[in-house]
Interface confidence: medium
């Protein structure tokens, strides 16, 4: 269950300010002495971190991935888990910490000196839980080793947003992922609905840039739910 995971060091989310004031995305977050999780009669410490629920890896931090906290992958909520370091087991790239990727079920360094020429990678994106794959849409993609030494430019194949240059994010494009521009003010964005999964977006957009959020365009309020246009707007 999630309770047992919370008692380990697996959950690595920033602690809340005990003062209780709502913070700002850029503000510092003060450390709490410990968050406790009520588990029956016994209280369990979470080592200063709280579980952060997620639906996909992009909702987590750069050093995290989204998965069920239990081995069996129960039907409950998925949370952001700390990324796996080198030589740890993995099932997909996002599970491995930046600078590593998943090869043959193990996180390996993606910037080793002996890398020459090209490496072949199977990019399998996970939807729903840790053990699901894209129903056979596993695409073999050739990645240049240069990708691991310099930040990817627009159109470069990537594994995660940290592989991309500033102003770009790693987003799905067909069955692969490439660096795409972070959305600017006024650009159309995708607003996922809380009910139901995010679905399969084969042409995924980046998120809105800092200081922007994805909202219904003012003149589209009267439109039907399904046809409402969302754009990146100032907070």
């Amino acid at each position: 269950t999630l309770n047992s995971v919370l008692n380990s060091n697996a959950i690595k989310n920033l602690p809340p300010p005990l003062g209780g004031a709502a913070g700002h995305p850029g503000s510092a977050v003060s450390a709490a002495p410990g968050i406790l999780y009520p588990g029956g009669n016994k209280y369990q410490t979470i080592d200063n971190y709280q579980p952060y629920p997620c639906a996909e890896d992009e909702e987590c931090g750069t050093d995290e991935y989204c998965a069920s906290p239990t081995r069996g992958g129960d039907a409950g909520v998925q949370i952001c888990l700390a990324c796996r370091k080198r030589r740890k087991r993995c099932m997909r790239h996002a599970m491995c910490c930046p600078g590593n990727y998943c090869k043959n079920g193990i996180c390996v360094s993606s910037d080793q000196n002996h890398f020459r020429g090209e490496i072949e990678e199977t990019i399998t994106e996970s939807f729903g839980n840790d053990h699901s794959t894209l129903d056979g849409y596993s695409r073999r993609t050739t990645l240049s080793s240069k990708m691991y030494h310099t930040k990817g430019q627009e159109g470069s194949v990537c594994l995660r947003s940290s592989d991309c240059a500033s102003g770009l994010c790693c987003a799905r494009h067909f069955w692969s992922k490439i660096c795409k521009p972070v959305l600017k003010e006024g650009q159309v964005c995708t607003k996922h609905r809380r009910k139901g999964s995010h679905g399969l977006e084969i042409f995924q957009r980046c998120y809105c840039g800092e200081g922007l959020s994805c909202r219904i365009q003012k003149d589209h309020h009267q439109a039907s739910n399904s046809s409402r246009l969302h754009t990146c707007q100032r907070h």
């Epitope: 809340p16 913070g23 997620c54 909702e59 931090g61 909520v77």
Partner: nanobody, 123 residues
């Protein structure tokens, strides 16, 4: 700036019910996870319930079957329906909204916090 305002707290008798609300502004509500935490006097803050952006929910063992977390995207509001309240549920209840992780370049996904609303269960 992200703002979260909780309401609905108060004094209730054991076995009674309360519905807490958390109005959010300054974030794309439906794309972020929400959580309810609580802090009893002299104790640490603890997790009560979570709801992910895809609607999946999770509850602390001590509140399972009694509390229900939900979210109304059209009102940018999260709720915590609390039934069969017990004296040990007495605490300040805090609403928390995830503000996204790698979207802002954070290495860890993080929460924004409301000021809290007091719930007292006593006869």
């Amino acid at each position: 700036e992200v703002q979260l305002v909780e309401s609905g707290g108060g004094l209730v008798q054991p076995g009674g019910s309360l519905r807490l609300s958390c109005a959010a502004s300054g974030l794309t509500f439906s794309t972020y996870p929400m959580g309810w935490f609580r802090q009893a006097p002299g104790k640490e803050r603890e997790l009560v319930a979570l709801i992910a952006s895809n609607g999946n929910t999770h509850y602390a063992d001590s509140v399972k079957g009694r509390f229900t977390i939900s979210a109304d995207n059209s009102k940018n509001t999260a709720y915590l329906q609390m039934n069969s309240l017990k004296p040990e549920d007495t605490a300040v209840y805090y609403c928390a909204a995830g503000n996204g992780g790698r979207a802002y370049g954070y290495s860890r996904a993080r929460y924004e916090w409301g000021q809290g609303t007091l719930v007292t269960v006593s006869s």
